[in-house]
């Protein structure tokens, strides 16, 4: 019973992590710069993301520009893009592996095989969490290094954007969820599959509610 509950919690956390990761990768808020001129009229905020940059004027008007050439982009930005996409795909793969081994599915009948699949999915989610963490920490490190570099001009200095915090949250949720799935797999078990089917059916809607907790309209 506890094992099933931990599995549900684990997969819900990883789904929330995946959604967080998706939002983090998509939003142009990795680096934030505030340019304040002599007059408040020219005050503007620049948001930089993996795919585009946006300028928000003091009037509230926002203009976004998608980065043109892939080859012209800095290597660290290309790497961050790649890692973000890979992390999301790896997490999706983890979800498929989990679904194949979940106690409420009939893809695999044998209990040991199911347990192994759930364990594998947990490991895959942990890997996804680590992959999410790398570009976020790398970008944060660069921002902090610039902040303390006396030869980097004030206008070139950035602040940590909301996407980085979302990325850390995503990584944490994927690591925690994956860890829980790894912990719920002692081989063998006395409960029958029908028992869990009932438990899962009542919990299923909770999964679909996860993403709505992050209102992306606030960010874009």
């Amino acid at each position: 019973m506890a094992s099933a509950g931990m599995q549900i919690l684990g997969v819900v956390l990883t789904l929330l992590g995946w959604v967080n990761g998706l939002v983090s990768c998509a939003l142009p808020m990795w680096k934030v710069t505030a340019f304040i001129g002599n007059s408040i009229v020219v005050a503007q905020v620049v948001w930089e993301g993996l795919w585009m940059s946006c300028v928000v004027q003091s009037t509230g008007q926002m203009q976004c520009k998608v980065y043109d050439s892939l080859l012209a982009l800095p290597q660290d930005l290309q790497a961050a893009r790649a890692l973000c996409v890979i992390a999301l795909l790896v997490a999706l793969f983890g979800l498929l592996v989990y679904l194949a081994g979940a106690k409420c599915t009939t893809c695999v009948e044998e209990k040991d095989s199911k347990a192994r699949l759930v364990l594998t999915s947990g490991i895959v989610f942990v890997i996804s969490g680590v992959l999410t963490l790398i570009p976020v920490c790398w970008t944060a490190h660069a921002i902090i290094r610039d902040f303390y570099n006396p030869l980097v001009a004030e206008a070139q200095k950035r602040e940590l954007g909301a996407s980085l915090y979302l990325g850390w949250a995503a990584s944490g949720l994927l690591l925690l969820g994956g860890g829980l799935l790894c912990c719920t797999c002692p081989s063998g078990g006395s409960q029958g599959p029908s028992h869990y089917m009932a438990r899962y059916s009542t919990s299923a809607p909770a999964i679909s509610r996860g993403p709505s907790e992050y209102p992306t309209k606030n960010y874009v």
Epitope: P74, P150, A153, Q156
Partner: antibody, heavy 119, light 107 residues
Amino acid sequence: EVKLVESGGGLVKPGGSLKLSCAASGFTFNPYTMSWVRQTPAKRLEWVVTISSGGGRTYYPDSVKGRFTISRDNARNTLYLQMSSLRSEDTAMYYCIRGDYRYDGFAYWGQGTLVTVST
Amino acid sequence: DIQMTQSPASLSASVGETVTITCRASENIDSYLAWYQQKQGKSPQLLVYASTLLVDGVPSRFSGSRSGTQFSLKINSLQSEDVARYYCQHYYSIPYTFGSGTKLEIK
């Protein structure tokens, strides 16, 4: 117009001390990072020291750490470089430099003051 | 310490020609590189920062580029007033170091 005028250079014996000054004018001194860079007789440029706008943080290369001290007086719009335990390899033209809000690196250079360490 | 290897040490070209000065960092410095110009008897002047960005007032015939740890300063349509020493400098981490300089002359 940004103006940086260095003074205090001269001939000094090895092991001796010297204090360089840099008088800044034409801009508000407080908000800017300031540095000293020297140019050896062989025309090589060497970064000497940097001080943050408030003066709270200072940055030195190992070659001068413990021997040179940078300071600033924001009220007097003046930058200082106290040099002690001078060596012959410290012989150089010393430039006072101001950073910039928009540009990275050493944005504005003074005309320099010559320091000669010799017996 | 990060070493900056600048080449060539000296360069002679005709007015109107295109010249390129290169600078290689001994390790990764991202785009934390500046170029300076020093005319005879004068102090150095900042030309380029962040490896590619030109300082206001610098003629557009000057351009900076980066490929990994190799950086270049290109001068298109060389003018007589471009006669000077050119230095690269990294500001990735302390200590900040300069290249040995390139002396540019007109033929």
